[in-house]
């Protein structure tokens, strides 16, 4: 089979063979090479020369195969917007940001632009675990049977009820979704004022 055309090459139907790495240049009606990530177009192509690419300067980047004549400026993660850096900007990738702990992304435009504090989950509930931390606000779900959570918190997890017998104690009061089991020494009666607490 014949070798494929190498840019620049004529394109009467205005489409290029490799859409990722080539682009149609309408003035010359040809397909030219895009510049690889981390570079930009320093000289445009013509019918007798392909695109000339140059490396992005420090503190700038281009993430994709492109025909941009400039590189994008690296931007820091804005702490005022609740963002923190997880990976620095390189010539091939913008600064990677995420919401600070205890926050979720409240505004999304291709990437997170603004984070807000996660809502508290009331006692007896916990935040449903998400695939990606910081992606959305808390969705509080009841503690499953045998577990409790006794604070208003965005991050507290339901804990298993204490098993009194594991500590050589006996149950004085059963646990609820909002409170732990109350245990007592098997030899001692539970004083009224100690109701709802665990005796050791």
């Amino acid at each position: 089979s014949q070798p494929q055309a190498v840019p620049p090459y004529a394109s009467e139907n205005q489409t290029c063979r490799d859409q990722e790495k080539e682009y149609y240049e309408p003035q010359h009606r040809i397909c030219c090479s895009r510049c690889p990530p981390g570079t930009y177009v320093s000289a445009k192509c013509s019918r007798i020369r392909d695109t000339v690419c140059a490396t992005c300067a420090e503190n700038s980047y281009n993430e994709h195969w492109n025909y941009l004549t400039i590189c994008q400026l690296c931007r820091p993660c804005d702490p005022v917007m609740g963002l923190e850096e997880i990976a620095p900007c390189t010539s091939k990738r913008k600064t990677q940001c995420r919401c600070q702990p205890g926050m979720f992304c409240a505004a999304w435009a291709l990437e997170c632009t603004h984070c807000e504090l996660l809502s508290d989950c009331p006692p007896g509930t916990e935040a449903e675990l998400k695939d990606e931390v910081g992606k959305g606000n808390n969705h509080c779900v009841p503690c499953k049977a045998g577990h409790f959570q006794n604070t208003s918190s965005p991050s507290a997890r339901c804990q298993p009820h204490t098993r009194c017998e594991n500590q050589g104690l006996v149950e004085a009061a059963p646990g609820t979704a909002q409170s732990d089991t109350t245990c007592k020494n098997p030899l001692e009666p539970l004083p009224p004022e100690m109701s709802g607490t665990m005796l050791m």
Epitope: P3, A5, V6, A10, E12, S46, R47
Partner: antibody
Framework: QVQLVESGGGVVQPGRSLRLSCAAS????????MHWVRQAPGKGLEWVTT????????YYADSVKGRFTISRDNSKNTLFLQMNSLRAEDTAVYYC????????????????WGQGTAVTVSS | QSVLTQPPSVSAAPGQKVTISCSGS????????VSWYQQLPGTVPKLLIY???KRPSGIPDRFSGSKSGTSVTLGITGLQTGDEADYYC???????????FGGGTKLTVL
């Protein structure tokens, strides 16, 4: 109006040198790749050399490589061809066309040829 | 020996149609646009067809161009005595990094 005027031709002995000029007007010379094309008496068109718009790259036909040098002065809108070690087979009319439909795709009256300048190499 | 191959001559009677072929390879005609030039006797070449098949303003529609693979064809209908000239195809050769021309075709109107 686009115009190209070649000059500098004449009769020269084999082994001698000659410098051709091409004065451009009516278009933005510095935006265009330029060329020299020659036509020997009774023969067809023969491409000689090409220079990029900014002078950064040059191409030569095998028949003139090492003997001819193309250059340009964009501030003066002028193209040059320095011809050294001339031979009888270099006898021709020399043109400096824009050939813009071939090299850039511009065609709005831009593929223009001058009247040419005659070079005769004879002892 | 030209990189692009044209017949040395063609002829036809006035009012007739004639075609001039120009064949090359993938690195020139195959990948690039072809221009046709007309050189009337004693004059300089003039652009006749560009981008394989387009006519500059002022060129009558009796002149046409087409491309198929690594060959192009110039067609002239309604031949006139004033069409007697040399016709050249030209393009860029990506492998040679050179402008390449056909050897030229002399058109005679009988």
């Amino acid at each position: 109006q686009v115009q190209l005027v070649e000059s500098g031709g004449g009769v020269v002995q084999p082994g001698r040198s000659l410098r051709l000029s091409c004065a451009a007007s009516g278009f933005t010379f510095s935006n265009y790749d330029m060329h020299w094309v020659r036509q020997a008496p009774g023969k067809g068109l023969e491409w000689v050399t090409t220079i990029w718009y900014d002078g950064s790259n040059k191409y030569y036909a095998d028949s003139v490589k090492g003997r001819f040098t193309i250059s340009r002065d964009n501030s003066k809108n002028t193209l040059f061809l320095q011809m050294n070690s001339l031979r009888a087979e270099d006898t021709a009319v020399y043109y400096c066309p824009t050939l813009s439909t071939v090299t850039t795709g511009d065609y709005y009256g831009m593929d223009v040829w001058g009247q040419g300048t005659a070079v005769t190499v004879s002892s | 020996q030209s990189v692009l191959t044209q017949p040395p001559s063609v002829s036809a009677a006035p009012g007739q149609k004639v075609t001039i072929s120009c064949s090359g390879s993938r690195s020139n005609i195959g990948n690039n646009y072809v221009s046709w030039y007309q050189q009337l006797p004693g004059t300089v070449p003039k652009l006749l067809i560009y981008d394989n098949s387009k006519r500059p303003s002022g060129i009558p529609d009796r002149f046409s161009g087409s491309k198929s693979g690594t060959s192009v064809t110039l067609g002239i209908t309604g031949l006139q005595t004033g069409d007697e000239a040399d016709y050249y195809c030209g393009t860029w050769d990506s492998s040679l990094s050179a402008v390449v021309f056909g050897g030229g075709t002399k058109l005679t109107v009988l």
